[in-house]
């Protein structure tokens, strides 16, 4: 079972001092960001017992394996169900604590009831404050049963549940009709999935015989030991004030485990710590009683004395739970309660025994779960003990379970059961992930999901060039870190596979699926320089560059031109996709802007060194368009244009440009300059008769401005073919600018 304990501090005089702590003894518990261990969760479960909303509870993490809930402001905050969730994957386990109000109308005689499938469970609610109304029993918040208040027996209301089955498990409550739910008695019923002493899918396996109030888990056959006891069968008591599967945890505070309720994974439930009893776990055991809730009786023999935490303390010469075994009887010594091996390994198992007469090699045997008996291959005889060594045949999964070491002499016999866990070495289910690549290295994340058992002790990354028959290169890495594969060949595909290992001999799993990772191509090394540039308009720039001459083919796929507009903090990138190109036209630039310009060679995704930068100032944009352009035919070869000056001019106009085009014609338009910017009319001469023309114009300051609207007009009559249009502004002749 998962080593998870939920502690409730029951010193209830002040709810603000109340706290719940969840402690995990699991390796890697609570490391939230760690892929190998989800965090511990501790929360109030309001699904069944709803209490009035209060200020949020405070959760504090103390290291990786402990979490504490505080911030209870009033007694009603405490009433209800709390749960702690810990363990990873299939071992994820929920531990539940049910808190009753000490001032409730009804109080449970016993909160947690663990029963076997088919048993009769009896829940008993003791009357604390009588009401003369019905008592309503509920199961998981839903109506279950009604009792008349007259039906109380010795001041208790009993709910009998015959032939219980696992679905009957849950939270039960007894409440007076119409009383506050906070005045209810709350119970937890845990129904094991098997009958007494059995476990496994078909309940065919026999429980190990848990001692000291331990409860046999119906899924894995392990004993869930009460707080303060340890060992495969809970046979060993912890030192006072200690708990956890290996007695590794210590009760907080000076009074040890007094006033603490301990909740453990099902099917154990909750109890006081060893040596304590009572609804608030503040009463010491009466003489002759010991253990959790003081449920155990000592019955010590041969002069043994009863310790309320550990049971019988035997005088020298005697051992056993009740000091009933003479030290002359052989005794198995220091047998580990749990051993772990990897699948298909052939481990050696040692079993030591002492006694009078002295055990010899043939008197110690090892029994597997299937009943097979192994005899020791050798024995080491020392003055105080004999250690038999057993060579175990290749392990299979069915070997998981309880093994037994047995010693027999004429003085008697002893046996010790221990749990063997056969673990499956982990096998990656996915290929590793490529994080970044360069021409000679790959950065890989080896963390992948896996089948089999953890924890992961090492990760091996195997790699070699794709389609190669050469040996694989191997790198051993930490499970939680990314790996850099170095000294690789550029532009080469590598097959990369992960192999995971768990602790112990034979813990290496099979290799995971391969993935193809390709190194980048070589970095371009040549540095271009800018030959020159010239402005082709307010928003256009032609740039040319050169490369140094080097022998051999050019390493590059093209060029990247970068324009940096420092005023606006904007960068413009232009990709020139031919490595032979030495010139480029940049369009759509911002007029009047100061740019810093550079060029660099690129190859695949890699950039070479940038050229020394150049600084370029684009001319500002031209003025707005002239307004109200109007055309009127004067003769068969002349059309007069009139307009109004543009509004909001940034400076004095240097000239106007008129564009003339035959309507529907396919030829290029003609541009005619009007060099007298103060004019607002001009005559275009030399036009063809009876021809429809299109006109538009724009002004120029430092650069050409926006075009005006386009106007249409036809020349008059059927005159001679003219040589081509010319322009006259008032009486002055103007040249033609095409």
């Amino acid at each position: 079972a998962v080593d998870l304990t939920l502690l409730a501090n029951l010193r209830l005089t002040d709810p603000q001092r109340f706290f719940l702590t969840c402690v995990s003894g699991e390796a890697g518990a609570g490391r939230g960001s760690d892929a190998w261990g989800p965090p511990l969760l501790l929360e109030k479960d309001d699904r069944i017992v709803r209490t009035p909303p209060g200020p949020p509870l405070r959760l504090a993490r103390n290291g990786s394996h402990q979490v504490t809930l505080r911030g209870f402001s009033k007694p009603s905050d405490l009433v209800g169900v709390f749960s702690c969730v810990g363990g990873a994957g299939a071992r994820r386990t929920r531990v539940i604590y049910v808190h009753n109000s000490p001032g409730a109308h009804l109080l449970p005689d016993k909160v947690t009831h663990t029963v076997n499938k088919g048993d009769t469970a009896v829940l008993s609610a003791r009357v604390h404050k009588e009401k003369q109304t019905d008592v309503i029993w509920k199961s998981n918040g839903s109506y279950f049963y009604t009792l008349d208040w007259h039906e109380a027996q010795d001041g208790r209301f009993l709910l009998q549940l015959p032939n219980v089955q696992p679905p009957s498990s849950g939270i039960y409550s007894a409440t007076y009709l119409e009383a506050s739910p906070l005045g209810s008695a709350f119970f937890r019923l845990i129904v094991r999935g098997c009958g007494a002493g059995r476990w496994g899918p078909g309940c065919t396996k026999e429980c190990p015989g848990c001692l000291h109030g331990g409860v046999c888990h119906d899924h894995d056959g392990e004993c869930v030991c009460p707080p303060g006891f340890t060992g495969t069968r809970c046979e060993q008591a912890c030192r006072e004030g200690r708990f956890g599967q290996s007695c590794q945890e210590q009760c907080p505070g000076i009074s040890g485990c007094r006033g603490l309720t301990f909740c453990l994974p099902d099917p154990y439930g909750c109890s006081c710590g060893s040596g304590w009893r009572g609804s608030q776990c503040q009463e010491a055991c009466a003489p002759g009683h010991f253990g959790a809730d003081c449920r155990l009786q000592c019955q010590c023999q041969n002069g043994g004395t009863c310790d309320r935490f550990s049971g019988c303390v035997c005088p020298s010469g005697w051992h056993g739970v009740h000091c009933e075994k003479s030290d002359r009887i052989p005794q198995i010594l220091n047998m580990a309660s749990e051993l772990e091996f990897n699948l298909e390994t052939m481990p050696r198992i040692n079993c030591a025994a002492a006694g009078n007469p002295f055990p010899v090699r043939g008197s110690i045997e090892l029994r597997k779960p299937d009943g097979t008996v192994l005899l020791s291959t050798k024995a080491i005889v020392e003055p105080e003990k004999t250690t038999a060594e057993f060579e175990v045949p290749r392990l299979v999964l069915a070997d998981s379970g309880f093994w037994e070491c047995r010693v027999s002499t004429s003085g008697g016999q002893d046996s010790r059961r221990f749990k063997v866990n056969v673990k499956v070495p982990p096998v990656p289910l996915a290929a590793p992930r490529l994080l970044t690549k360069q021409s000679r290295q790959l950065v890989v994340s080896p963390l992948v999901s896996f089948s089999g058992d953890g924890p992961i002790s090492t990760v091996r990354l195997h790699y070699r060039p794709q389609d190669s028959t050469m040996d694989w290169s191997t790198i051993v890495v930490d499970p939680s870190e990314n790996v850099t594969l170095m000294n690789l060949r550029p532009k080469t595909g590598y097959s990369v596979r992960v192999q995971l290992s768990r602790p112990g001999e034979g813990g290496e799993g099979a290799w995971g699926p391969p993935t193809l990772m390709t190194t980048d191509c070589p970095e371009p090394l040549l540095q271009p320089w800018l030959e020159g540039w010239h402005v082709e308009g307010t928003d256009r720039l032609r740039v040319s560059w050169s490369l140094p001459l080097v022998p051999g083919p050019l390493v590059g796929d093209g060029f990247l031109l970068r324009l940096w507009d420092g005023t606006r903090g904007q960068e413009r990138r232009e990709n020139v996709s031919s490595p032979q190109a030495r010139t480029a036209l940049l369009t759509g630039l911002t007029p009047g802007t100061h740019y810093q310009l550079d060029v660099q060679l690129y190859h695949c995704t890699l950039l070479g060194p940038a050229s020394p930068p150049a600084h370029v100032l684009l001319p500002p944009s031209g003025p707005p368009a002239p307004r109200h352009l109007h055309a009127q035919a004067l003769s068969d070869s002349e059309i007069q244009l009139t307009w109004k000056h543009p509004e909001a001019l940034p400076g004095p106009i240097s000239k106007y440009v008129v564009e003339v085009q035959v309507a529907g014609g396919a030829g290029d338009p003609l541009w005619i300059d009007v060099d007298r910017p103060e004019e607002t009319s001009t005559i275009i001469r030399g036009l063809n008769a009876s021809t429809r023309y299109l006109f538009r114009m724009r002004a120029s300051i430092q650069g050409l401005g926006d075009w005006s609207n386009t106007v249409e007009e036809s020349t008059l009559g059927n005159g001679l073919q003219a040589e081509g249009p010319v322009q006259e502004s008032r009486a002055a002749e103007e040249g033609l600018d095409q």
């Epitope: 109304t133 049963y145 009792l147």
Partner: antibody
């Protein structure tokens, strides 16, 4: 689906006896408190009696105390009302009802009892 | 013993809303009550339980048009978007030591 089906009603002379039955289905009968409620023609509802799940405790309205007996057979999922010394004022439709936390949450369709000479 | 008072009749138009009242006798203003509907020639049907704080728990299959509320010693049943099948007798009911108590009922007519 919860169903309650009353039977056993009919015409009876004053002073006579009648036994009503209520067959329950669709729920765990043995866990619920059960009741009888009656309704005289054109009148409102009047509670008659109830019985606890175990059958060990019963209550009656003053108007029927000593004359009527409520009982149940949990193995047959059936509720009964034994009515003795019937009077004209006992004429009514008798409904059986399942109680949940103080109130009837399911009712039967009723059976008519007529006490007349 | 608690007494429950209901007005004998109420009426409202099809599609409109109606609010029925049940008054608890003095000293019983903290009691919860239940509402039951009885359509003509049928057995009663449980609608909902209404607590003194106005919270209510409806029976299985009761439409959202039915809601309960509370003010002092008064308990209310509100039916919105009235339909012709809502024409029925409505009884309030409470419980005490050893008995159930019903109100006299309100006959609701849908116009």
């Amino acid at each position: 689906e919860v169903q309650l089906l009353e039977s056993g009603g009919g015409l009876v002379q004053p002073g006579g006896s009648l036994r009503l039955s209520c067959a329950a289905s669709g729920f765990t009968f043995s866990r619920y408190k059960m009741s009888w409620v009656r309704q005289a023609p054109g009148k409102g509802l009047e509670w008659v009696s109830y019985i606890y799940p175990s059958g060990g405790h019963t209550e009656y309205a003053d108007s029927v105390k000593g004359r009527f007996t409520i009982s149940r057979d949990n193995s047959k999922n059936t509720l009964y009302l034994q009515m003795n010394s019937l009077r004209a004022e006992d004429t009514a439709v008798y409904y059986c009802a399942r109680e949940r936390e103080g109130t009837p949450d399911y009712w039967g369709q009723g059976t008519l009892v007529t006490v007349s000479s | 013993q608690s007494a429950l008072t209901q007005s004998p009749s109420a009426s409202a138009s099809l599609g409109a809303s109606v609010k029925l009242t049940c008054s608890l006798s003095s000293g019983h203003s903290s009691y919860a009550i239940a509402w039951h509907q009885q359509q003509p020639e049928k057995g009663p049907q449980y609608l909902m339980k209404v607590n003194s704080d106005g919270s209510h728990t409806k029976g299985d299959g009761i439409p959202d048009r039915f809601s309960g509320s509370s003010s002092g010693a008064e308990r209310y049943l509100t039916i919105s978007s009235l339909q012709s099948e809502d024409e029925a007798d409505y009884y309030c009911q409470t419980w005490g030591t050893g008995s159930w108590v019903f109100g006299g009922g309100t006959k609701l007519t849908v116009l």
